[in-house]
Amino acid sequence: LKGQEFAPSHQQVYAPLRADGDKPRAHLTVVRQTPTQHLKNQFPALHWEHELGLAFTKNRMNYTNKFLLIPESGDYFVYSQVTFRGMTSECSEIRQAGRPNKPDSITVVITKVTDSYPEPTQLLMGTKSVCEVGSNWFQPIYLGAMFSLQEGDKLMVNVSDISLVDYTKEDKTFFGAFLL
């Protein structure tokens, strides 16, 4: 029959591509920290700005009580940078001679909390040594990777010493995630 020569021999069904603008995403920025109690075996979690300046949460991604809440299951890119600053940090041997309050390392951990699992999971961890004699120091630690996350998962950023976090600029210390 006429016209049949143009008919495809098989039909392919394509799922409509999801617009990037519809996907959950958030970028949180540093804010002044308030001293809070934290668990004995866990570094304190940072509090974040979710709405002012460069910060935002979109498409059901929510921030509450130091946690970024994952609204749907999928593969997410999760990232954080924490910039630390401090006064001169003496090296280990000097520290051992009676200055135990000076850190010789700084650590950032991105942690996942799942309600159905009792223990928080460390997703990413970064550590740097700070041993700069004779100067004040600044050290950024950047972490970022892709993870398969489930709806209801909660993400937070923990640091070894909240008092050393540089909260003066929103482009120095930040935390975010977006659905790929």
Epitope: R32, H47, E49, E51, L52, G53, N65, T168
Partner: antibody, heavy 118, light 107 residues
């Protein structure tokens, strides 16, 4: 101790532009969010908008078409311009500081009354 | 915009009384709720931030509670200097919005 001080004319004619400046002393204007808030006589407080030290602004949609907030970090000042004013814009205008969403407006200027009248 | 509703709009009480003021948000604001005190002719003063955190320098007789949409400010024992107007304010989203105030008067 951080202090905020509003300055500008107390009387503005209808259809003209209201201009106010807030001078910040005792601390840096950097790393904070700086807002303008107004209170018509005997009425509720109304947030006008904020500016960040980087120059980023966000305005109340109800006033957005008439508002401009700017900042001069070298002078530790930020300013408000409200165009096409009417009698409804008569209010005490406050400048205020916000450290972040979590912390509220922790420092305020003493306020300046601006009357719109011919 | 998030609407903030305060009640009561005015309240008479005596020195030493325990007083509670309530504030309701038109949608959940988690704990992004602040309380201010304003005396006549003065600027508002921050009392409580993040629903329950006492601002530095504020007497401990002031306390706040609540989360989501319903919040309260409590003054445990009224002092003469507490007679003023109190405002709640949400800082969950912009535009920032305030309640219209509760005027606390001497009985």
């Amino acid at each position: 101790q951080v202090q905020l001080q509003e300055s500008g004319p107390g009387l503005v004619k209808p259809s003209e532009t209201l201009s106010l400046t807030c001078t910040v002393s005792g601390g840096s204007i950097s790393s904070y969010f700086w807002s303008w808030i107004r209170q018509p006589p005997g009425k509720c407080l109304e947030w006008i908008g904020y500016i960040y030290y980087s120059g980023q602004t966000k305005y109340n949609p109800s006033l957005k078409s008439r508002v401009t907030i700017s900042i001069d970090t070298s002078k530790n000042q930020f300013s408000l311009k409200l165009s096409s004013v009417t009698a409804a814009d008569t209010a005490v205008y406050y400048c205020a500081r916000e450290t972040g969403s979590y912390y509220g407006f922790d420092y305020w200027g003493q306020g300046t009354l601006v009357t719109v009248s011919s | 915009d998030i609407q903030m509703t305060q009640s009561p709009s005015s309240l008479s009480a005596s020195v030493g009384d325990r007083v509670t003021i309530t504030c309701r948000a038109s949608q959940s604001i988690n704990n992004y709720l602040n309380w201010y005190q304003q005396r006549p002719g003065k600027a508002p003063k921050l009392l409580i931030y993040a629903a329950s955190s006492l601002q530095s320098g504020v007497p401990s007789r002031f306390s706040g509670s609540g989360s989501g949409t319903d919040f309260t400010l409590t003054i445990s024992s009224l002092q003469p200097e507490d007679f003023a107007t109190y405002y709640c304010q949400q800082s969950y989203s912009t535009p920032r919005t305030f309640g219209c105030g509760t005027k606390l008067e001497i009985k």
